[in-house]
């Protein structure tokens, strides 16, 4: 009679994580008598997956009734497959004895596991940057298998080309991670912009995963300042305004200086928002010119988002105004765009 052969017909099997894997194995003879065992790998480090004779293997079930005497099908199903189950599985026939001895092995079935990538996480730089600067964004996704994956970057729907991507580990693993770094040049209009990382993988069936980062968390648009003198509102009083335009984020502190001396400090509160997401704000100072004998240098100093202060000055010509006798108050009346105190 022909000697028993162990047949594993599938050289490889690919299964999605969470599903069951069926590993086929048949023998060509009932002789010699003895159990079947399944192993992952061969050699001294092989791992027992199923023993027909004894043991508890909660994730493994036999496909046919392996307890029947005439059964020659020893295929198994492994439930709830994870990437850690990847490997080469051998169906091994043992000869009954004390102890049972290995008799024949199948050629092996390579099990690969398809696992979905995690939702991409996009992170930007730790510190804000100003327009015209290049900033880096990273995108990470983990836990996918097989290794083949496609990653794309977009800014407001436009595909970016300046990025570098690595898939780790370099070689075979139960699962993989992808890490990509994209370089983005900021513009003044980027407050409402989004950077998107898109990951496509065989397990996603054409529906890629996306991770986003809002450039509002990355960009700092420094303000432009304009100091102007308004027409005289009352006798001996001049209204000077400081227009703070096109800044982002809102965090801003303004200080008025009169000939270098601090006159008032205030924080931007009621701002107006521009279409591009930047803000405008206005502060004014009411100056009593009669209190001054000489010209007054008024400075609007702005500290935006913790950055070094920027300032704009305006020279107020006192000689053009008649001086009020007995007045020693320089700037009694001050105001801003949200309150006027007279």
């Amino acid at each position: 009679e022909e000697e028993l052969q162990v047949i594993q017909p599938d050289k490889s099997v690919s299964v999605a994580a969470g599903e069951s894997a069926i590993l086929h194995c048949t023998v060509t003879s009932l002789i010699p008598v003895g159990p079947i065992q399944w192993f992952r790998g061969a050699g001294p480090a092989r791992e027992l997956i199923y023993n027909q004779k004894e043991g508890h293997f909660p994730r493994v079930t036999t496909v046919s009734e392996s307890t029947k005497r005439e059964n020659m099908d020893f295929s198994i199903s492994i439930s709830n497959i994870t990437p850690a189950d990847a490997g080469t599985y051998y169906c091994v026939k043992f000869r009954k004895g004390s102890p049972d001895t290995e008799f024949k092995s199948g050629a092996g079935t390579e099990l690969s596991v398809r696992a979905k990538p995690s939702a991409p996480v996009v992170s930007g730089p730790a510190a804000r940057a100003t327009p015209q600067h290049t900033v880096s964004f990273t995108c990470e996704s983990h836990g996918f298998s097989p290794r083949d994956i496609t990653l794309k970057w977009f800014k407001n729907g436009n595909e970016l080309s300046d990025f570098q991507t690595n898939v780790d580990p370099v070689g075979e693993s139960v699962s993989y991670s992808i890490h990509s770094t994209a370089k983005v040049v900021l513009t003044r209009e980027d407050v409402h912009s989004q950077v998107i990382c898109e990951v496509a993988h065989v397990t996603l069936q054409g529906d890629p995963l996306r991770g986003t980062a809002n450039l509002s968390e990355t960009i700092r648009v420094p303000p432009t300042l304009e100091v102007t003198q308004q027409p005289v509102r009352a006798e001996n009083q001049v209204n000077v305004t400081c227009q703070v335009r096109k800044f982002y984020p809102q965090r801003l502190q303004l200080t008025w200086l009169e000939n270098g001396n601090v006159s008032r400090t205030e924080t931007a509160s009621t701002v107006t928002e521009n279409k591009d997401g930047t803000y405008n704000w206005m502060s004014w100072l009411l100056v009593n010119v009669s209190a001054h004998r000489d010209d007054v240098k008024l400075t609007c100093q702005v500290e935006h988002d913790g950055q070094p202060a920027v300032s704009k000055s305006h020279d107020l010509k006192v000689s053009a105004h008649p001086k009020e006798q007995g007045s020693n108050t320089a700037a009694e009346n001050t105001g801003s765009n949200e309150r006027n105190i007279y």
């Epitope: 061969a42 050699g43 290995e102 024949k104 370099v170």
Partner: antibody, heavy 123, light 107 residues
Framework: QIQLVQSGPELKKPGETVKISCKAS????????MSWVKQAPGKGLKWMVW????????TYADDFKGRFAFSLETSASTSYLQINNLKNEDTATYFC????????????????WGQGTLVTVSA | DIVMTQSQKFMSTTIGDRVSITCEAS??????VAWYQQKPGQSPKLLIY???NRYTGVPDRFTGSGSGTDFTLTISNMQSEDLANYFC?????????FGSGTKLEVK
């Protein structure tokens, strides 16, 4: 196709050090474990070490502990064998050989072999 | 260490013969045995793994058998290109060990 290409022959004096390389191509290097096997002239094969190329952890045969150092440069898909304080009995052809299993924690037989590097130790 | 004994260092054969090369393990190794062919100046070539599984592309005149401690490589129809040295290897336990080899020569 899959290839293991080893560095060329070496002629050394006793007490010197030799370092030979095995560059893998045609597959992902860390997919498969790698072994080194010694064959003295006219003699049989002697297994030296198995290296898990994914973790870099080696498993040695007792005879090859001490003067023998095995290392990997995964970015270059290369395995190295260094023999320190060479002795006459180190004269042999050294082969690198690749594992069969794509999930490399279970070394067994050897599917692919390098062409061998002859190391001659002579005063 | 497990010793793999190939008692016949040389075997004389005729083209067309059936040749059996034996290998004995000093302790039970199950079926964790591989066979290799090596020609002069070449590296070994895998023929059989798991005692009886023919590796891909190996001619079917090569057959492996045995389990436990006694193993045989059989060449059913000896060809001139089969003149070479044949080694068995156990991979049941570390350190992996090889037999000393059996060299096939033509009569």
């Amino acid at each position: 196709q899959i290839q293991l290409v080893q560095s060329g022959p070496e002629l050394k004096k006793p007490g010197e050090t030799v370092k030979i390389s095995c560059k893998a191509s045609g597959y992902t290097f860390t997919t498969y474990g790698m072994s080194w096997v010694k064959q003295a002239p006219g003699k049989g094969l002697k297994w030296m070490v198995w290296i898990n190329t994914y973790s870099g952890v080696p498993t040695y045969a007792d005879d090859f502990k001490g003067r023998f150092a095995f290392s990997l440069e995964t970015s270059a898909s290369t395995s190295y064998l260094q023999i320190n304080n060479l002795k006459n009995e180190d004269t042999a052809t050294y082969f690198c050989a690749r594992d069969p299993h794509y999930y490399g924690s279970s070394p067994a037989w050897f599917v692919y072999w390098g062409q061998g590097t002859l190391v001659t130790v002579s005063a | 260490d497990i010793v793999m004994t190939q008692s016949q260092k040389f075997m004389s054969t005729t083209i067309g013969d059936r040749v059996s090369i034996t290998c004995e393990a000093s302790q039970i190794v199950g079926i964790a045995v591989a066979w290799y062919q090596q020609k002069p100046g070449q590296s070994p070539k895998l023929l059989i793994y798991s005692a009886s599984n023919r590796y891909t592309g190996v001619p079917d005149r090569f057959t492996g058998s045995g389990s436990g401690t006694d193993f045989t490589l059989t060449i059913s129809n000896m060809q001139s290109e089969d003149l070479a040295n044949y080694f068995c290897q156990q991979y049941s336990a570390y350190p992996f060990t090889f037999g000393s080899g059996t060299k096939l020569e033509v009569k």
